[in-house]
């Protein structure tokens, strides 16, 4: 991470970076197209999942861990 600060601290997993283990189950939201890694500025974007970047739209998208849902994998999946 760069030499910067956030205040107050945002809680969340920085999932999808080296050394981290995530299970890809659900894509939220579902989009087609080319994906790349997310900019590191989004390392806390996906709460319980892995971030990927929709290149054409220049937007982050989350692949949720099992049992989680929502655009940022912020909700427990009650149907899991």
């Amino acid at each position: 991470s760069g030499n910067s600060t956030r205040s107050p601290e945002t809680n969340g997993l920085s999932c999808g970076y080296p050394g981290e283990n995530c299970t890809a189950t659900t894509v939220q939201p579902k989009r087609k197209g080319h994906f790349s890694r997310c900019p590191k500025q989004y390392k806390h974007y996906c709460i319980k999942g892995r971030c990927r970047f929709v290149v054409a739209e220049q937007t982050p998208s989350c692949i949720c861990d099992e049992g989680y849902t929502g655009a940022r994998c912020e909700r427990v999946d009650l149907f899991y």
Partner: antibody
């Protein structure tokens, strides 16, 4: 057409504070990240910090942490940058700039006209 | 912080010349890089986003390329209005950082 209109030039004493405003029109103010970028005379561009939509809060460059506060008033579509404990090295043109993204800080596609802040005793 | 280094710092060129400016990041930033043009007394103007995408309204003589750590801005045929200072900027990580600028002057 998006427009960012900044407040006028300021002359400040060392140790004092300055608050620069940036009023947006022609777009959805709350959806986009507003950053502040400064440029000292004859120098390059320096990002100070910005409000990040998905965080709902400001992020600051470490260099300015504790001295700068960036806020936004959605009711008036106006962003503010307050810099305290001013010193002569803070003499610069201060720009507000809108990020092209409604998520984070990406490219700065719209800029204010700049506000010259002169710090002198 | 991610350091952005531009080269050259300045260059002299003539109208019609092909001009190339390079920008190097201190670590890989994928293609999370933008280019701006700034004229004296004016705010910067976005030219290229995401390394190679031309911003709407920008003439097609401007192009960008590169990925990882090395990037290039090319002006295929320099026009009188292109004499300005050009900056690269990374948006991979906070804090956002700019190159020191490249001033394109008339030869």
């Amino acid at each position: 057409q998006v427009q960012l209109v900044q407040s006028g030039a300021e002359v400040k004493k060392p140790g004092s504070s300055v608050k620069v405003s940036c009023k947006a029109s022609g777009g959805t103010f709350s959806s986009y990240a507003i950053s502040w970028v400064r440029q000292a005379p004859g120098q390059g561009l320096e990002w100070m910090g910005g409000i990040v939509p998905w965080m709902g809060e400001a992020v600051y460059a470490q260099k300015f942490q504790g001295r700068v506060t960036i806020t936004a008033d959605e009711s008036t579509s106006t962003a503010y940058m307050e810099l305290s404990s001013l010193r002569s090295e803070d003499t610069a043109v201060y720009y507000c700039a809108r990020s092209s993204s409604t998520y984070g800080i990406h490219a700065f596609d719209y800029w204010g006209q700049g506000t010259l802040v002169t710090v002198s005793s | 912080d991610i350091q952005m280094t531009q080269s050259p710092s300045s260059l002299s060129a003539s109208v019609g010349d092909r001009v190339t400016i390079t920008c190097r990041a201190s670590q890989s930033i994928s293609n999370f890089l933008n280019w701006y043009q700034q004229k004296p007394g004016k705010a910067p103007k976005l030219l290229i986003y995401a390394a190679s995408n031309l911003q709407s309204g920008v003439p097609s003589r401007f192009s960008g390329s590169g990925s990882g750590t090395d990037f290039t801005l090319t002006i295929s045929s320099l026009q009188p209005e292109d004499f300005a200072t050009y900056y690269c900027q990374q948006y991979d990580d906070f804090p956002m950082t700019f190159g020191q600028g490249t001033k394109v002057e008339i030869k």
